[in-house]
Amino acid sequence: MMTGTIETTGNISAEKGGSIILQCHLSSTTAQVTQVNWEQQDQLLAICNADLGWHISPSFKDRVAPGPGLGLTLQSLTVNDTGEYFCIYHTYPDGTYTGRIFLEVLESSVAEHGARFQIP
């Protein structure tokens, strides 16, 4: 029976040109984590294998840094990076746990866009 739960950073925003840390945490299970995959839509960003360490996909090599921990750092953000990101925990014997993060990349500083979020 799968008893674990994934906590994520949830919905986050960052500035164009900046960087952001995507973080997930698996709790409430004693299952062994064998591998964590990070994905954006149908593109694999990175794999962190418990034995072998990190593999960064060739398409993201210059913009993705491993860590901290099992998290992932996205750098040089563009508006096209806006979207859903998934952390997939492969565990034994439980199976697979998936966490979702939504990232919004803003054109310029959050301060300048403050009005967008104000109630009229």
Epitope: T34, E39, D42, Q43, L44, I47, H55, P58, H90
Partner: antibody, heavy 119, light 107 residues
Framework: DVQLQESGPGLVKPSQSLSLTCTVT?????????WNWIRQFPGNRLEWMGY???????RYNPSLKSRISITRDTSKNQFFLQLSFVTTEDTATYYC????????????WGQGTSVIVSS | DIVMTQSHKFMFTSVGDRVSITCKAS??????VAWYQQKPGQSPKLLIH???YRYTGVPDRFTGRGSGTDFTFTINSVQAEDLAVYYC?????????FGGGTKLEIK
């Protein structure tokens, strides 16, 4: 260049253990990579059996978990496969291969060694 | 385990033709797929990783594409030396698994 070479007996009796050696030249097995065993059955089907990581951690295919052991001798730059309680179903060509985290695919392979299980 | 299915065991082609080999995963594997070529009497050789990236030294007539569950490996302008068995393999999750292979034969 990385080179891998399998060696071991070509004939094993049913219920006995199969033992193979992979000798690696041109790269230290403690530096990086996963050092894998893969077998190819008659009819061409390929099966990943398991690996030992550069740090010495083994990982096995669950279908073989109770019968397989992968170990290494770092002084000889070799890693080993032991498969116990073999049956005729274990007749195959056995390959050792390396997997690097740059590509996450088997980029160097040995030439393979044929093992027949028969009494 | 993830099952990788190559629906064609054999494909027949002529020198100079373009040929595409398909591979279907039983569940989502993102783009964590590699393709290998195995010539008669030889060990497999890595051609493509990350679904679409050619390995070092692989001629550009070999291409790969796909993500999710459906993958295609294409040889543009087949050469006589391309006669071989081609395998897909997923590395999305352990245990790593291979397709059953597609044998390319020259008409």
């Amino acid at each position: 260049d990385v080179q891998l070479q399998e060696s071991g007996p070509g004939l094993v009796k049913p219920s006995q253990s199969l033992s193979l050696t992979c000798t690696v030249t041109g790269y230290s097995i403690t530096s990086d990579y996963a050092w894998n065993w893969i077998r190819q059955f008659p009819g061409n089907r390929l099966e990943w059996m398991g690996y030992i990581s550069y740090s010495g951690a083994p990982r096995y295919n669950p279908s073989l978990k109770s019968r397989i052991s992968i170990t290494r001798d770092t002084s000889k730059n070799q890693f080993f496969l032991q498969l116990s309680f073999v049956t005729t179903e274990d007749t195959a060509t056995y390959y050792c291969a390396s997997l690097g985290t740059d590509y996450y695919a088997m980029d160097y392979w040995g030439q393979g060694t044929s093992v027949i299980v028969s009494s | 385990d993830i099952v990788m299915t190559q629906s064609h065991k054999f494909m027949f082609t002529s020198v100079g033709d373009r040929v595409s080999i398909t591979c279907k995963a039983s569940q989502h594997v993102s783009n964590a797929v590699a393709w290998y070529q195995q010539k008669p009497g030889q060990s497999p050789k890595l051609l493509i990783h990350s679904a679409s990236y050619r390995y070092t030294g692989v001629p550009d007539r070999f291409t790969g594409r796909g993500s999710g569950t459906d993958f295609t490996f294409t040889i543009n302008s087949v050469q006589a030396e391309d006669l071989a068995v081609y395998y897909c393999q997923q590395y999305y999750s352990l245990p790593w698994t291979f397709g059953g292979g597609t044998k390319l034969e020259i008409k």
